[in-house]
């Protein structure tokens, strides 16, 4: 190797200056004894290199690029060799930003997968490899005092969410949770959440079905539907409230919301609908009165209201 580049920093803030030095060894005898070292950033020649011979006979060229405005570029030093440019050495330069503070950190406890899933917004593009780590600890109080640390949760590349498995969770106890973002230019941390996993529980929705008509029960009136639902069994003992939504299958009507319904109702007569009309219905539930997240809406149930009964005119005889 005849030449070697060293740089003040291979990774800098976008727009910052960078200084580089290229040294050509004396024993490169096939070279011109007074070679002119040239600099190139990407495909563009860069003027402004200051060249000198050092006491040991090596040649050095120093260049300062006042603003590195490329997020990634190769800086090379070269010599004119005949009619071509002979590259002696090159380095990759990176420029970007330190990570912004991750924001909008939120978590939900998924009882179906027995894990606490947290997500966040990473902030603006840094143009640099940036790692995110979900960090947490157990706390007996309100997270002012740190208990046992929980194993870091590292999301897959490019993802802004991570799942803490049940074995690292303590239900009905607070956890301190935050996201740390790190790249070559710095580290930032989100504000800390302090939460009991059960207070961010997200239940699975009940299964909505039509109520089996019983022989002794009156059939539904026109414009009414008799519904029942089967709670998600693993969440049966969690007090919940639920809500229904419905809309006619045809037309552009928006959803109409009915609720809150106690989960315990398990059955409901929905009236005030159009007779002889097909409806789409869904139900969802939330832990209540304790905190929680709404479940997703249940799979749709499609039902048709009965025809309007024929009107009979009754003649009342007064005696």
């Amino acid at each position: 190797e005849c030449g070697h580049i060293s740089v003040s920093a291979p990774i800098v803030h976008l727009g910052d200056p960078i200084t580089a030095s290229c040294i050509i060894k004396q024993n490169c005898s096939h070279l011109d004894p007074e070679p002119q070292i040239l600099w190139r950033l990407g495909a563009e020649l860069q003027p402004g290199g200051r060249q000198q011979r050092l006491s040991d006979g090596t040649q050095e060229s120093i260049i300062t690029l006042p603003h590195l405005n490329h997020t990634q570029a190769f800086l090379s030093c070269a010599l004119n060799w005949g009619n071509s440019l002979q590259i002696l050495d090159q380095v990759e330069l990176r420029a970007g930003y330190p990570p912004a503070i991750p924001h909008n950190l939120s978590c939900l406890m998924n009882l179906a997968t027995s894990s606490l899933i947290c997500q966040w917004e990473p902030g603006p593009e840094t143009h640099l490899p940036t790692s995110f780590t979900l960090k947490s600890f157990k706390s007996r109080g309100n997270c002012q005092t740190q208990g046992d640390s929980i194993l870091d949760c590292v999301p897959k590349d490019g993802q802004s969410h991570c799942s803490i498995p049940r074995k690292h969770l303590l239900l009905y106890q607070n956890m301190g949770i935050w996201v740390q973002a790190e790249n070559a230019l710095g580290t930032s941390m989100s504000p800390q959440l302090c939460l009991d996993p059960m207070d961010v529980v997200k239940l699975e929705p009940p299964m909505l079905r039509t109520m089996d008509p019983s022989p002794e029960a009156a059939p539904p009136q026109a414009g009414c539907l008799q519904l029942s639902w089967e709670p998600w069994q693993p969440g049966l003992h969690i007090n919940q409230k639920c809500e229904l939504r419905h809309k006619p299958q045809r037309g552009e009507a928006s959803w109409a919301l009915v609720g809150p319904l106690p989960l315990e109702a398990l059955q409901y007569e929905l009236c005030g609908l159009l007779p002889a009309t097909a409806y789409t219905l869904q139900i969802r539930c939330i832990r209540w009165p304790l905190p929680g997240h709404w479940s997703d809406w249940s799979p749709s149930l499609e039902l048709r209201t009965t025809e309007r009964a024929p009107t009979h005119h009754h003649h009342h005889h007064h005696h």
């Epitope: 009882l111 179906a112 997968t113 027995s114 049940r166 074995k167 239900l171 059960m198 709670p231 069994q233 693993p234 049966l236 003992h237 969690i238 007090n239 106690p262 315990e264 109702a265 398990l266 009165p289």
Partner: antibody
Framework: EVQLLESGGGLVQPGGSLRLSCAAS????????MGWVRQAPGKGLEWVSS????????PYADSVKGRFTISRDNSKNTLYLQMNSLRAEDTAVYYC???????????WGQGTLVTVSS | DIQMTQSPSSLSASVGDRVTITCRAS??????LNWYQQKPGKAPKLLIY???NLQNGVPSRFSGSGSGTDFTLTISSLQPEDFATYYC?????????FGGGTKVEIK
């Protein structure tokens, strides 16, 4: 401190009836599911029935369905188990217990013995 | 119905021993598995809920692990007061069901 105190156990003839009570204190009774678990002499634990916080949902074990009725009076902080058509195999210590949100029993009462024998 | 099978049904151990009791569900129950300790003439006492959460006031020598169908209760160093019968219970669906119990006796 959460306390559960069962009463109403005793000796009853096959086919007879008995009503167990469980008085609760130390917690907001109306917010919790409650349940009955029994244990025959020298045997393991068997769930009998549970009741939701306001009494609308009442699952039962197949072995007692149609014969036993669970109920509660939230104004009196009391849980009940009405046992009809009793059989010899219903002989057991009956425990009342508060249910946790994910279905565990804690705490338990001290138990009341029901003996069905002629 | 979900059947719960506990093993062994009894074991003899000495103070200081590490003791492991297993519980197997006849179908997957996620983490809905609870462990109880019962001493003669007394009501059961909750030790572990939701497979691995230690109930308040229970010594840290007790621990629970597992998910799906296979679960374990471990006592890291058996103490004299730990000689009792231990039960597992699934709370994934009704009917709620218990294992047959494991009696831990003094060797």
């Amino acid at each position: 401190e959460v306390q559960l105190l069962e009463s109403g156990g005793g000796l009853v003839q096959p086919g007879g009836s008995l009503r167990l009570s469980c008085a609760a204190s130390g917690f907001t009774f109306s917010l919790y599911w409650m349940g009955w678990v029994r244990q025959a002499p020298g045997k393991g634990l068997e769930w009998v029935s549970s009741i939701s916080s306001s009494g609308g949902v009442t699952p039962y074990a197949d072995s007692v369905k149609g014969r036993f009725t669970i109920s509660r009076d939230n104004s009196k902080n009391t849980l009940y188990l009405q046992m009809n058509s009793l059989r010899a195999e219903d002989t057991a210590v009956y425990y009342c217990a508060k249910l946790g949100e994910l279905g565990w029993f804690d705490p338990w009462g001290q138990g009341t013995l029901v003996t069905v024998s002629s | 119905d979900i059947q719960m099978t506990q093993s062994p049904s009894s074991l003899s151990a000495s103070v200081g021993d590490r003791v492991t009791i297993t519980c197997r569900a006849s179908q997957g129950i996620s983490s809905y598995l609870n462990w109880y300790q019962q001493k003669p003439g007394k009501a059961p006492k909750l030790l572990i809920y939701y497979a691995s959460n230690l109930q308040n006031g229970v010594p840290s020598r007790f621990s629970g692990s597992g998910s799906g169908t296979d679960f374990t209760l471990t006592i890291s160093s058996l103490q004299p007061e730990d000689f009792a019968t231990y039960y597992c219970q699934q709370s994934y669906s009704t009917p709620l069901t218990f294992g047959g119990g494991t009696k831990v006796e003094i060797k």
